[in-house]
Protein backbone atom coordinates (compact mmCIF):
# COMPACT_ATOMS: atom_id res chain seq x y z
CA UNK A 1 0.00 0.00 0.00
CA UNK A 2 1.44 3.36 -0.98
CA UNK A 3 -0.08 6.45 0.57
CA UNK A 4 0.89 9.75 -0.97
CA UNK A 5 0.20 13.28 0.18
CA UNK A 6 0.00 16.49 -1.76
CA UNK A 7 2.57 19.20 -1.22
CA UNK A 8 2.57 23.02 -1.29
CA UNK A 9 -0.17 25.34 -2.51
CA UNK A 10 -3.59 24.03 -1.60
CA UNK A 11 -4.16 21.53 1.18
CA UNK A 12 -2.91 18.04 0.55
CA UNK A 13 -5.21 15.09 0.03
CA UNK A 14 -4.40 11.45 0.65
CA UNK A 15 -4.03 9.22 -2.39
CA UNK A 16 -3.63 5.47 -1.93
CA UNK A 17 -2.45 2.90 -4.48
CA UNK A 18 -1.97 -0.86 -4.33
CA UNK A 19 0.84 -2.61 -6.22
CA UNK A 20 -0.65 -5.22 -8.52
CA UNK A 21 0.01 -7.58 -11.39
CA UNK A 22 -1.48 -7.81 -14.86
CA UNK A 23 -2.12 -11.03 -16.77
CA UNK A 24 -0.94 -10.41 -20.32
CA UNK A 25 -3.67 -10.55 -22.94
CA UNK A 26 -6.33 -9.96 -20.32
CA UNK A 27 -7.71 -6.80 -18.69
CA UNK A 28 -6.01 -5.44 -15.59
CA UNK A 29 -6.74 -2.86 -12.90
CA UNK A 30 -4.37 -0.27 -11.47
CA UNK A 31 -5.88 0.56 -8.08
CA UNK A 32 -6.01 4.12 -6.75
CA UNK A 33 -8.30 5.81 -4.25
CA UNK A 34 -8.43 9.37 -2.94
CA UNK A 35 -10.33 11.59 -0.53
CA UNK A 36 -13.49 12.26 -2.51
CA UNK A 37 -15.01 15.58 -3.47
CA UNK A 38 -18.74 16.28 -3.57
CA UNK A 39 -18.84 17.66 -7.09
CA UNK A 40 -17.40 16.02 -10.16
CA UNK A 41 -16.37 19.25 -11.88
CA UNK A 42 -13.49 19.76 -9.44
CA UNK A 43 -11.95 16.29 -9.75
CA UNK A 44 -8.95 15.71 -11.98
CA UNK A 45 -7.37 12.26 -12.32
CA UNK A 46 -4.07 11.84 -14.13
CA UNK A 47 -2.30 8.54 -14.62
CA UNK A 48 1.34 8.76 -15.66
CA UNK A 49 3.97 6.11 -16.33
CA UNK A 50 7.69 6.47 -15.68
CA UNK A 51 9.57 6.70 -18.96
CA UNK A 52 6.47 7.49 -21.03
CA UNK A 53 6.11 11.00 -22.45
CA UNK A 54 2.35 11.19 -22.89
CA UNK A 55 -0.31 10.57 -20.27
CA UNK A 56 -1.64 7.11 -19.59
CA UNK A 57 -5.10 8.56 -18.91
CA UNK A 58 -6.72 11.80 -17.84
CA UNK A 59 -10.20 12.42 -16.46
CA UNK A 60 -11.24 16.00 -15.81
CA UNK A 61 -14.38 18.10 -15.69
CA UNK A 62 -16.48 14.97 -15.58
CA UNK A 63 -15.11 13.22 -18.66
CA UNK A 64 -12.08 11.56 -20.22
CA UNK A 65 -9.58 14.02 -21.67
CA UNK A 66 -7.37 11.95 -23.96
CA UNK A 67 -5.74 14.55 -26.20
CA UNK A 68 -2.36 14.05 -24.49
CA UNK A 69 -2.64 10.30 -24.11
CA UNK A 70 0.42 8.31 -25.12
CA UNK A 71 0.01 6.16 -28.23
CA UNK A 72 0.82 2.92 -26.40
CA UNK A 73 -2.33 3.34 -24.25
CA UNK A 74 -4.70 4.54 -26.99
CA UNK A 75 -8.07 2.82 -26.70
CA UNK A 76 -6.95 0.65 -23.78
CA UNK A 77 -7.78 2.70 -20.68
CA UNK A 78 -10.88 3.67 -18.73
CA UNK A 79 -11.72 4.93 -15.26
CA UNK A 80 -14.75 3.70 -13.35
CA UNK A 81 -16.74 6.84 -14.19
CA UNK A 82 -19.60 6.13 -11.81
CA UNK A 83 -17.22 5.74 -8.85
CA UNK A 84 -14.98 8.79 -9.31
CA UNK A 85 -17.34 10.82 -7.12
CA UNK A 86 -16.67 8.47 -4.19
CA UNK A 87 -12.89 8.62 -4.58
CA UNK A 88 -12.16 5.72 -6.90
CA UNK A 89 -9.51 6.68 -9.45
CA UNK A 90 -8.64 3.10 -10.41
CA UNK A 91 -7.74 2.53 -14.04
CA UNK A 92 -8.93 -0.37 -16.15
CA UNK A 93 -6.24 -1.41 -18.62
CA UNK A 94 -7.42 -3.52 -21.53
CA UNK A 95 -5.33 -6.24 -23.17
CA UNK A 96 -2.35 -6.02 -20.81
CA UNK A 97 1.03 -6.16 -22.57
CA UNK A 98 4.39 -7.25 -21.17
CA UNK A 99 5.61 -3.68 -21.78
CA UNK A 100 2.90 -2.25 -19.50
CA UNK A 101 5.05 -3.21 -16.49
CA UNK A 102 6.63 -0.32 -14.62
CA UNK A 103 6.05 2.50 -12.16
CA UNK A 104 2.79 4.44 -12.48
CA UNK A 105 1.73 7.62 -10.72
CA UNK A 106 -1.88 8.33 -9.76
CA UNK A 107 -2.15 12.13 -9.49
CA UNK A 108 -5.32 13.73 -8.13
CA UNK A 109 -6.60 17.30 -7.91
CA UNK A 110 -9.84 18.18 -6.11
CA UNK A 111 -11.29 21.36 -4.62
CA UNK A 112 -9.66 20.27 -1.34
CA UNK A 113 -6.12 19.95 -2.66
CA UNK A 114 -3.67 17.76 -4.55
CA UNK A 115 -2.02 14.42 -3.94
CA UNK A 116 -0.32 11.53 -5.67
CA UNK A 117 0.99 8.03 -5.07
CA UNK A 118 3.12 5.63 -7.08
CA UNK A 119 2.22 2.09 -8.01
CA UNK A 120 4.47 -0.77 -9.14
CA UNK A 121 2.78 -2.78 -11.86
CA UNK A 122 4.16 -6.15 -12.84
CA UNK A 123 3.08 -8.05 -15.92
CA UNK A 124 3.29 -11.71 -16.75
CA UNK A 125 1.04 -14.69 -17.22
CA UNK A 126 -0.49 -16.93 -14.61
CA UNK A 127 -3.26 -19.48 -14.67
CA UNK A 128 -4.94 -22.05 -12.50
CA UNK A 129 -3.45 -25.54 -12.58
CA UNK A 130 -5.56 -28.64 -12.96
CA UNK A 131 -4.38 -31.96 -11.58
CA UNK A 132 -5.68 -35.19 -13.04
CA UNK A 133 -4.94 -38.87 -12.77
CA UNK A 134 -3.06 -40.00 -15.90
CA UNK A 135 -4.72 -43.28 -16.74
CA UNK A 136 -2.52 -43.75 -19.84
CA UNK A 137 0.62 -44.17 -17.75
CA UNK A 138 1.96 -47.59 -16.72
CA UNK A 139 2.08 -46.71 -13.00
CA UNK A 140 -0.14 -44.49 -10.87
CA UNK A 141 0.67 -41.04 -12.26
CA UNK A 142 -0.64 -37.51 -11.72
CA UNK A 143 -0.55 -34.84 -14.41
CA UNK A 144 -0.61 -31.13 -13.49
CA UNK A 145 -1.35 -28.71 -16.33
CA UNK A 146 -1.55 -24.92 -16.42
CA UNK A 147 -2.13 -23.23 -19.79
CA UNK A 148 -0.34 -19.85 -19.45
CA UNK A 149 2.68 -18.78 -17.41
CA UNK A 150 5.40 -16.14 -17.82
CA UNK A 151 8.14 -15.73 -16.73
CA UNK A 152 8.99 -19.42 -16.49
CA UNK A 153 7.80 -20.68 -13.10
CA UNK A 154 9.07 -23.33 -10.74
CA UNK A 155 6.95 -26.39 -10.10
CA UNK A 156 7.04 -28.24 -6.79
CA UNK A 157 5.03 -31.27 -5.74
CA UNK A 158 4.01 -31.94 -2.15
CA UNK A 159 1.88 -34.52 -0.38
CA UNK A 160 -0.12 -34.53 2.80
CA UNK A 161 1.13 -37.91 3.93
CA UNK A 162 4.84 -37.40 3.12
CA UNK A 163 5.21 -33.83 4.36
CA UNK A 164 8.59 -32.34 3.57
CA UNK A 165 9.40 -35.03 1.02
CA UNK A 166 11.32 -34.04 -2.11
CA UNK A 167 9.48 -35.24 -5.20
CA UNK A 168 11.94 -33.85 -7.77
CA UNK A 169 13.32 -37.35 -8.46
CA UNK A 170 9.88 -38.78 -9.22
CA UNK A 171 8.48 -35.87 -11.21
CA UNK A 172 9.10 -34.41 -14.64
CA UNK A 173 8.21 -30.85 -15.66
CA UNK A 174 8.12 -29.40 -19.17
CA UNK A 175 7.39 -25.95 -20.57
CA UNK A 176 5.83 -25.59 -24.00
CA UNK A 177 5.81 -22.18 -25.72
CA UNK A 178 2.31 -21.03 -26.66
CA UNK A 179 1.46 -19.75 -30.13
CA UNK A 180 1.99 -16.07 -29.26
CA UNK A 181 5.64 -16.91 -28.41
CA UNK A 182 5.60 -15.36 -24.92
CA UNK A 183 3.60 -17.45 -22.50
CA UNK A 184 4.18 -21.15 -21.89
CA UNK A 185 2.08 -24.13 -21.03
CA UNK A 186 3.28 -25.90 -17.89
CA UNK A 187 3.00 -29.67 -17.65
CA UNK A 188 4.32 -31.59 -14.67
CA UNK A 189 3.99 -35.32 -14.14
CA UNK A 190 4.34 -37.05 -10.77
CA UNK A 191 5.05 -40.80 -10.75
CA UNK A 192 4.53 -43.55 -8.18
CA UNK A 193 1.62 -41.92 -6.38
CA UNK A 194 -0.20 -43.76 -3.62
CA UNK A 195 -3.91 -43.95 -3.03
CA UNK A 196 -5.64 -42.23 -0.05
CA UNK A 197 -3.31 -39.24 -0.21
CA UNK A 198 -3.63 -35.58 -1.15
CA UNK A 199 -1.06 -34.24 -3.61
CA UNK A 200 -0.38 -30.58 -4.39
CA UNK A 201 1.18 -29.18 -7.53
CA UNK A 202 2.58 -25.70 -6.74
CA UNK A 203 3.48 -23.37 -9.59
CA UNK A 204 5.19 -20.09 -8.77
CA UNK A 205 6.98 -17.18 -10.43
CA UNK A 206 7.70 -13.67 -9.13
CA UNK A 207 4.14 -12.57 -9.91
CA UNK A 208 1.85 -15.37 -8.82
CA UNK A 209 1.64 -18.62 -6.94
CA UNK A 210 -0.93 -21.24 -7.88
CA UNK A 211 -1.74 -24.58 -6.31
CA UNK A 212 -3.70 -27.50 -7.66
CA UNK A 213 -4.70 -30.18 -5.14
CA UNK A 214 -5.98 -33.67 -5.83
CA UNK A 215 -7.18 -36.24 -3.32
CA UNK A 216 -7.38 -39.74 -4.68
CA UNK A 217 -9.27 -42.46 -2.81
CA UNK A 218 -10.65 -45.79 -4.00
CA UNK A 219 -14.12 -44.33 -4.36
CA UNK A 220 -13.59 -40.75 -5.54
CA UNK A 221 -11.29 -37.99 -6.75
CA UNK A 222 -11.49 -34.49 -5.26
CA UNK A 223 -9.81 -31.45 -6.84
CA UNK A 224 -9.19 -27.91 -5.66
CA UNK A 225 -7.27 -25.00 -7.17
CA UNK A 226 -6.08 -21.70 -5.75
CA UNK A 227 -4.22 -18.72 -7.23
CA UNK A 228 -2.59 -15.88 -5.33
CA UNK A 229 -0.86 -12.75 -6.63
CA UNK A 230 2.37 -12.16 -4.79
CA UNK A 231 2.97 -8.44 -4.92
CA UNK A 232 -0.22 -6.78 -3.69
CA UNK A 233 1.36 -4.09 -1.53
CA UNK A 234 -0.59 -0.93 -0.79
CA UNK A 235 0.99 2.45 -1.09
Amino acid sequence: LIIGFGISGRHSITVTTVASAGNIGEDGILSCTFEPDIKLSDIVIQWLKEGVLGLVHEFKEGKDELSEQDEMFRGRTAVFADQVIVGNASLRLKNVQLTDAGTYKCYIITSKGKGNANLEYKTGAFSMPEVNVDYNASSETLRCEAPRWFPQPTVVWASQVDQGANFSEVSNTSFELNSENVTMKVVSVLYNVTINNTYSCMIENDIAKATGDIKVTESEIKRRSHLQLLNSKAS
Partner: antibody, heavy 117, light 107 residues
Amino acid sequence: EVQLQQSGTVLARPGASVKMSCKASGYTFTSYWMHWVKQRPGQGLEWIGAIYPGKSDTTYNQKFEGKAKLTAVTSDSTAYMDLSSLTNEDSAVYYCTSSVRNAMDYWGQGTSVTVSS
Amino acid sequence: ETVMTQSHKIMSTSVGDRVTITCKASQDVRTAVAWYQQKPGQSPKLLISSASYQYTGVPDRFTGSGSGTDFTFTISSLQAEDLAVYYCHQYYNTPLTFGAGTKLELR
Protein backbone atom coordinates in the same frame (compact mmCIF):
# COMPACT_ATOMS: atom_id res chain seq x y z
CA GLU B 1 -24.30 -3.85 5.55
CA VAL B 2 -24.32 -0.05 5.34
CA GLN B 3 -26.94 1.59 7.56
CA LEU B 4 -27.79 5.17 8.48
CA GLN B 5 -29.96 5.46 11.58
CA GLN B 6 -31.54 8.88 12.16
CA SER B 7 -32.96 10.33 15.37
CA GLY B 8 -36.71 10.56 15.94
CA THR B 9 -39.45 13.07 15.19
CA VAL B 10 -39.03 16.59 16.53
CA LEU B 11 -41.69 19.13 17.46
CA ALA B 12 -40.30 22.64 18.02
CA ARG B 13 -41.45 26.22 18.57
CA PRO B 14 -40.69 29.02 16.09
CA GLY B 15 -37.35 30.62 16.90
CA ALA B 16 -36.02 27.50 18.64
CA SER B 17 -33.12 25.28 17.55
CA VAL B 18 -33.00 21.53 16.99
CA LYS B 19 -30.20 19.02 16.65
CA MET B 20 -30.66 15.75 14.82
CA SER B 21 -28.30 12.83 14.46
CA CYS B 22 -27.39 10.21 11.88
CA LYS B 23 -25.44 7.16 13.09
CA ALA B 24 -23.53 5.34 10.38
CA SER B 25 -22.47 1.70 10.39
CA GLY B 26 -21.11 -0.84 7.91
CA TYR B 27 -18.50 1.40 6.26
CA THR B 28 -15.55 3.66 7.10
CA PHE B 29 -17.36 6.76 8.30
CA THR B 30 -14.31 9.05 7.97
CA SER B 31 -13.71 8.25 4.28
CA TYR B 32 -16.95 9.39 2.64
CA TRP B 33 -19.09 12.50 2.43
CA MET B 34 -22.30 12.65 4.44
CA HIS B 35 -24.98 14.83 2.84
CA TRP B 36 -28.15 16.28 4.31
CA VAL B 37 -31.28 16.70 2.20
CA LYS B 38 -34.54 18.49 3.03
CA GLN B 39 -37.97 17.45 1.81
CA ARG B 40 -40.99 19.61 2.58
CA PRO B 41 -44.37 17.81 2.72
CA GLY B 42 -45.44 16.88 -0.80
CA GLN B 43 -42.39 18.65 -2.24
CA GLY B 44 -39.13 17.70 -3.89
CA LEU B 45 -35.59 17.23 -2.55
CA GLU B 46 -33.27 20.06 -1.58
CA TRP B 47 -29.57 19.67 -0.80
CA ILE B 48 -28.53 21.41 2.43
CA GLY B 49 -24.83 20.59 2.55
CA ALA B 50 -22.31 17.89 3.31
CA ILE B 51 -19.54 17.01 5.73
CA TYR B 52 -16.38 14.94 5.22
CA PRO B 53 -15.87 13.48 8.70
CA GLY B 54 -12.23 12.52 8.13
CA LYS B 55 -11.22 16.18 8.01
CA SER B 56 -14.39 17.88 9.28
CA ASP B 57 -14.64 19.65 5.91
CA THR B 58 -18.08 21.11 5.30
CA THR B 59 -19.76 22.50 2.20
CA TYR B 60 -23.14 24.23 2.32
CA ASN B 61 -25.82 25.24 -0.09
CA GLN B 62 -25.70 29.05 0.23
CA LYS B 63 -29.44 29.01 0.91
CA PHE B 64 -28.81 27.16 4.20
CA GLU B 65 -25.71 29.06 5.39
CA GLY B 66 -26.52 30.29 8.90
CA LYS B 67 -29.55 28.00 9.11
CA ALA B 68 -27.84 24.61 9.22
CA LYS B 69 -24.63 23.59 10.94
CA LEU B 70 -23.08 20.20 10.18
CA THR B 71 -20.76 18.38 12.56
CA ALA B 72 -19.51 14.83 13.01
CA VAL B 73 -18.10 12.78 15.87
CA THR B 74 -15.79 10.18 14.34
CA SER B 75 -15.41 8.14 17.53
CA ASP B 76 -19.01 6.97 17.30
CA SER B 77 -19.55 7.41 13.54
CA THR B 78 -22.33 9.94 13.99
CA ALA B 79 -23.13 13.02 11.92
CA TYR B 80 -25.22 15.87 13.34
CA MET B 81 -27.20 18.73 11.91
CA ASP B 82 -28.24 21.77 13.94
CA LEU B 83 -31.06 23.91 12.61
CA SER B 84 -31.47 27.33 14.22
CA SER B 85 -34.08 30.13 14.29
CA LEU B 86 -36.81 27.76 13.21
CA THR B 87 -39.78 28.93 11.16
CA ASN B 88 -42.70 27.13 9.54
CA GLU B 89 -40.58 26.87 6.39
CA ASP B 90 -38.28 24.50 8.26
CA SER B 91 -41.05 21.95 8.81
CA ALA B 92 -39.86 19.04 6.70
CA VAL B 93 -38.31 15.58 6.67
CA TYR B 94 -34.52 15.76 6.79
CA TYR B 95 -32.47 12.92 5.37
CA CYS B 96 -28.84 12.09 5.85
CA THR B 97 -27.34 10.29 2.86
CA SER B 98 -23.83 9.06 2.23
CA SER B 99 -21.93 8.55 -1.00
CA VAL B 100 -20.09 5.28 -0.36
CA ARG B 101 -20.04 3.26 -3.56
CA ASN B 102 -21.83 5.83 -5.65
CA ALA B 103 -23.66 9.15 -5.60
CA MET B 104 -25.90 9.36 -2.49
CA ASP B 105 -26.37 5.61 -2.46
CA TYR B 106 -27.33 5.12 1.19
CA TRP B 107 -30.10 7.06 2.93
CA GLY B 108 -31.33 7.29 6.49
CA GLN B 109 -35.03 6.84 7.23
CA GLY B 110 -35.46 10.58 7.74
CA THR B 111 -36.14 12.83 10.73
CA SER B 112 -39.44 14.69 10.70
CA VAL B 113 -39.34 18.24 12.07
CA THR B 114 -42.56 20.13 12.76
CA VAL B 115 -42.38 23.80 13.72
CA SER B 116 -45.52 25.00 15.40
CA SER B 117 -46.50 27.49 18.05
CA GLU C 1 -27.15 27.14 -9.56
CA THR C 2 -27.85 24.34 -12.02
CA VAL C 3 -31.60 23.96 -12.42
CA MET C 4 -32.82 20.45 -13.27
CA THR C 5 -36.14 20.57 -15.09
CA GLN C 6 -38.36 17.51 -15.24
CA SER C 7 -41.00 18.39 -17.81
CA HIS C 8 -43.77 16.17 -16.45
CA LYS C 9 -44.86 16.50 -12.85
CA ILE C 10 -47.31 13.60 -13.23
CA MET C 11 -47.42 10.84 -15.84
CA SER C 12 -50.37 8.51 -16.29
CA THR C 13 -49.23 5.01 -17.16
CA SER C 14 -50.34 1.40 -17.34
CA VAL C 15 -48.62 -1.78 -16.23
CA GLY C 16 -46.44 -3.04 -19.09
CA ASP C 17 -45.93 0.43 -20.59
CA ARG C 18 -42.55 1.73 -21.66
CA VAL C 19 -42.11 4.88 -19.59
CA THR C 20 -39.64 7.65 -20.41
CA ILE C 21 -38.92 10.55 -18.05
CA THR C 22 -36.81 13.46 -19.23
CA CYS C 23 -34.65 15.88 -17.31
CA LYS C 24 -32.97 19.00 -18.65
CA ALA C 25 -30.06 20.72 -16.94
CA SER C 26 -29.72 24.51 -17.21
CA GLN C 27 -25.99 24.06 -17.90
CA ASP C 28 -23.62 21.31 -18.97
CA VAL C 29 -23.26 18.70 -16.23
CA ARG C 30 -21.39 16.12 -18.38
CA THR C 31 -22.74 12.77 -17.16
CA ALA C 32 -22.89 13.64 -13.45
CA VAL C 33 -26.56 12.77 -13.13
CA ALA C 34 -28.29 10.26 -10.88
CA TRP C 35 -31.89 9.05 -10.79
CA TYR C 36 -33.78 8.18 -7.59
CA GLN C 37 -37.05 6.45 -6.87
CA GLN C 38 -39.14 7.47 -3.87
CA LYS C 39 -42.25 5.70 -2.70
CA PRO C 40 -44.69 7.29 -0.20
CA GLY C 41 -43.31 7.32 3.33
CA GLN C 42 -39.93 5.97 2.21
CA SER C 43 -36.46 7.39 1.64
CA PRO C 44 -35.22 7.93 -1.92
CA LYS C 45 -33.43 4.99 -3.50
CA LEU C 46 -30.58 5.29 -6.01
CA LEU C 47 -31.28 3.61 -9.35
CA ILE C 48 -28.87 5.16 -11.86
CA SER C 49 -25.64 7.13 -11.48
CA SER C 50 -23.30 8.77 -14.00
CA ALA C 51 -26.34 9.12 -16.31
CA SER C 52 -26.33 5.48 -17.41
CA TYR C 53 -24.75 3.22 -14.77
CA GLN C 54 -27.25 0.93 -13.12
CA TYR C 55 -26.74 0.74 -9.36
CA THR C 56 -26.17 -2.64 -7.68
CA GLY C 57 -29.30 -4.76 -7.46
CA VAL C 58 -31.43 -2.48 -9.64
CA PRO C 59 -33.64 -4.42 -12.10
CA ASP C 60 -32.60 -4.29 -15.77
CA ARG C 61 -35.84 -2.61 -16.77
CA PHE C 62 -34.47 0.68 -15.35
CA THR C 63 -32.02 2.45 -17.67
CA GLY C 64 -30.63 5.94 -18.08
CA SER C 65 -28.94 7.86 -20.87
CA GLY C 66 -27.77 11.32 -21.86
CA SER C 67 -24.94 13.76 -21.35
CA GLY C 68 -24.43 17.49 -21.26
CA THR C 69 -27.88 18.97 -20.62
CA ASP C 70 -30.39 16.34 -21.75
CA PHE C 71 -31.07 13.18 -19.78
CA THR C 72 -33.55 10.35 -20.04
CA PHE C 73 -34.70 7.72 -17.58
CA THR C 74 -36.59 4.72 -18.96
CA ILE C 75 -38.59 1.88 -17.48
CA SER C 76 -38.86 -0.68 -20.29
CA SER C 77 -41.98 -2.40 -18.95
CA LEU C 78 -43.69 -0.79 -15.98
CA GLN C 79 -44.51 -3.03 -13.02
CA ALA C 80 -47.07 -2.12 -10.35
CA GLU C 81 -44.28 -1.72 -7.78
CA ASP C 82 -42.65 0.98 -9.95
CA LEU C 83 -45.41 3.49 -9.18
CA ALA C 84 -43.47 6.18 -7.34
CA VAL C 85 -41.88 9.61 -7.73
CA TYR C 86 -38.64 9.74 -9.74
CA TYR C 87 -36.06 12.48 -9.27
CA CYS C 88 -33.05 13.41 -11.37
CA HIS C 89 -30.05 14.88 -9.53
CA GLN C 90 -26.86 16.56 -10.69
CA TYR C 91 -23.58 16.37 -8.77
CA TYR C 92 -21.37 18.20 -11.24
CA ASN C 93 -21.64 21.62 -9.55
CA THR C 94 -22.51 22.95 -6.13
CA PRO C 95 -25.08 23.46 -4.91
CA LEU C 96 -26.08 19.91 -5.77
CA THR C 97 -29.58 20.07 -7.19
CA PHE C 98 -32.57 17.83 -7.86
CA GLY C 99 -35.40 17.94 -10.36
CA ALA C 100 -38.89 18.60 -9.01
CA GLY C 101 -39.82 14.96 -9.50
CA THR C 102 -42.11 13.01 -11.83
CA LYS C 103 -44.92 11.01 -10.26
CA LEU C 104 -46.05 7.87 -12.06
CA GLU C 105 -49.67 7.00 -11.49
CA LEU C 106 -52.03 4.46 -13.03
CA ARG C 107 -54.09 5.66 -15.96
